[in-house]
């Protein structure tokens, strides 16, 4: 098991729009139709003002109007919920579809896409119903923008909630070589298909993807627990033939100085098809992007039952070393290295300030907001501090899969 690793199934807590944990000052918009439809009126289930945020401009055809929520700290956002305008039950404005953009630093914005590259999310069919959208893959974000859409000139209004949990790993980005394709009886695509950073010259940098999405792969890397996805989907993999150095090098950037106890790497070991655990791992540490690597690298040779073909989490001790950047080399012990998840066990160094602009107020690991309770068809789960359930039969959730 990935000790200390977050469980995406439990990361579904209301982040504070409905219960006002998110203050008005952290909700903004590109424009508002009037003060009574300002951004602060965009809270799910709220009837404040004229009952929603409504942009001043048309969202057709440009789709440039947005509602922005600042979560103040990095969160894993697993679901979003939307509603139209309340207006004492007389509101007629809602958004049939929308896009999401998100940012971890307030500078670089990424468009959310589902596992098949679709950006447009099905929204509401009426002004009052709440429609929840499972975000597969989830997004690691501090700021989230909702861009309502329309297929003609019309008024749209929006109330929203976000659901997820605090991103306590603190990982801002990882840099890695682009994953490769293995050819068996069918092509096995071992690329990082949800990576949200840049790709240049065979290197991915500045983003997060499948190695940080909480989903660990199966023993047989050709199979996935996700439906309707290609062979190899859960894993990112590299062939020994492509690396004359004999290792794959990755770099990890964190939000602030941390003391690192361990790195956990979920690896495939289906050696009959060429996948092997790394023979060893070597990590270097530094406190800033332009600083020198400090001290001796931490080296860890992997023992254990290498003949056991089951996938497993390998724990690499990091000795409490303090850093904001890690560079790790994973040594080939066979034809292929296949990873499905990498996580870190670390503690924030108390006197360190965050790498992102501004100082963040403390936030609980589980935000206190309960899930919405006005559905008759929620899953049968206790209320209060429980992950939010999907509104059964909601038209939003369109997974292209089996």
């Amino acid at each position: 098991d990935m000790k200390g690793h977050f469980d995406p199934a439990k990361c579904r807590y209301a982040l504070g729009m409905q219960d006002r944990t998110i203050p008005d000052s952290d909700i903004s918009a590109s424009s508002s139709w009037s003060d009574s439809t300002a951004a602060r009126h965009s809270r799910l289930e709220s009837s404040d003002g004229d009952g929603a945020w409504c942009p001043a401009g048309s969202v057709f055809p440009k789709e440039e109007e947005y509602l922005q929520v600042d979560l103040q700290r990095l969160h894993l956002v697993a679901l979003v919920g939307t509603q139209g305008r309340h207006a004492g039950g007389l509101g007629k404005e809602f958004s049939r579809s929308y896009r999401l953009r998100y940012s971890r630093d307030g500078r670089r914005w990424m468009g959310w896409k589902d596992r098949w590259g679709q950006e447009v999310i099905s929204g509401n069919e009426d002004p009052e119903g709440v429609v929840l959208k499972d975000l597969g893959p989830p997004m690691v974000a501090r700021l989230v923008r909702f861009y309502p859409r329309a297929d003609r000139v019309m008024s749209v209004c929006l109330r929203v909630e976000l659901y997820g949990c605090l991103w306590r790993d603190g990982l801002l980005s990882y840099t890695a070589p682009v994953g490769q394709t293995m050819y068996l009886s069918e092509a096995v695509y071992l690329n990082d298909s949800t990576y949200d950073g840049h790709t240049v010259g065979g290197l991915q940098y500045g983003g997060l993807g499948q190695l940080a999405d909480g989903v660990v792969g199966l023993d047989d890397f050709r199979k996935s627990q996700e439906l309707r996805v290609w062979p190899g989907y859960d894993y990112v993999g590299w062939s020994n033939h492509s690396f004359s150095s004999g290792y794959v090098e990755m770099e990890f950037e964190f939000d602030r100085l941390r003391a690192f106890q361990a790195m956990q790497v979920h690896c495939n070991n289906m050696h009959t098809l060429g996948a092997r655990l790394p023979g060893g791992v070597e990590c270097r540490f530094r406190r800033g992007p332009a600083m020198a690597w400090e001290g001796e690298p931490m080296r860890h040779n992997l023992g254990g039952n290498l003949g056991d073909p089951r996938a497993r989490a390998v724990s690499v001790p990091l000795g409490g070393r303090v850093a904001r950047f890690l560079q790790c080399r994973f040594l080939f012990a066979g034809p292929w290295l296949l990873f499905s998840e990498i996580s870190f066990i670390s503690d924030v160094v108390n006197n360190s300030s965050p790498a992102l602009g501004g100082t963040f107020p403390p936030a609980p690991w589980w935000p206190p907001g309960p899930p919405p309770t006005n559905f008759s068809s929620l899953e049968l789960e206790p209320r209060g501090q429980q992950p939010v359930a999907k509104a059964e039969g909601s038209p939003t959730i369109e997974f292209r899969m089996d």
Epitope: A9, R222, K223, E226, E379, K390, D402
Partner: antibody, heavy 117, light 111 residues
């Protein structure tokens, strides 16, 4: 391995609702996979009815959409089938099963449901 | 909906010989360079059992006597050599498009 077991009444009257439970052991239904209901008619024809995804979303066979509902209770690791307004044509063996991107790898043993007055 | 047509409806093969059965889809079930077609074996009183996934991959624990081939809309399941335990009905199933559909089955008997 994942183990699934169907349970529910074996006789339902026409126009009533059919309700079945699938209890899953050795695996959490919120951790992965899609959790499906499939039925087999007396002539052995197999029909996929719908699923609930591990993330909570549902998808139904359009031929049943107005009558079917699949829900779950994650605390009990169970998922449920409700089929409304049944007729004698709904008689058959009902299976719960799970799938990833490689077909229905795990099946329950099935439960025979007869719709009869 | 994608219709899967299996042929023959029934098949009698001598022990030790090869059995071959076909599944034809009304449209392609390929995507991402792979075929979302799977094969199952069902014996009386039992649920279907996954044999082959994504056209040609042998499910773990299934003997190598079973093999699958094909792409797009034409697929074949072969059993070589046939053994007494193989007497069953064999179904193909596609998961490329909702709703997922099954073929009507091929019943294998021993001559």
């Amino acid at each position: 391995d994942v183990h699934l077991q169907e349970s529910g009444p074996d006789l339902v009257k026409p126009s009533q609702s059919l309700s079945l439970t699938c209890t899953v052991t050795d695996y959490s239904i919120t951790s992965g996979y899609g959790w499906h209901w499939i039925r087999q008619f007396p002539g052995n024809k197999l029909e996929w009815m719908g699923y609930i995804h591990y993330g909570g979303s549902t998808k139904y066979n359009s031929s049943l959409k107005s009558r079917i509902s699949i829900t779950r209770d994650t605390s009990k690791n169970q998922f449920f089938l409700q089929l409304k307004s049944v007729t004698t044509d709904d008689t058959g063996t009902y299976y719960c099963a799970t799938s990833g991107n490689y077909g229905f790898a795990y099946w329950g043993q099935g439960t025979l449901v007869t719709v009869s007055a | 909906d994608i219709v899967l047509t299996q042929s023959p409806t029934s098949l009698a093969v001598s022990l030790g010989q090869r059995a071959t059965m076909s599944c034809r889809a009304s449209e392609s079930v390929d995507d991402y360079g792979t075929s979302f077609m799977h094969w199952y074996q069902q014996k009386p009183g039992q649920p279907p059992k996954l044999l082959i996934y994504r056209a040609s991959n042998l499910e773990s624990g299934i003997p190598a006597r079973f093999s699958g081939s094909g792409s797009r809309a034409d697929f074949t399941l072969s059993i070589n050599p046939v053994e007494p335990d193989d007497v069953a009905t064999y179904y193909c199933q596609q998961s490329n498009e909702d709703p997922f559909t099954f073929g009507s089955g091929t019943k294998l008997e021993i001559k």
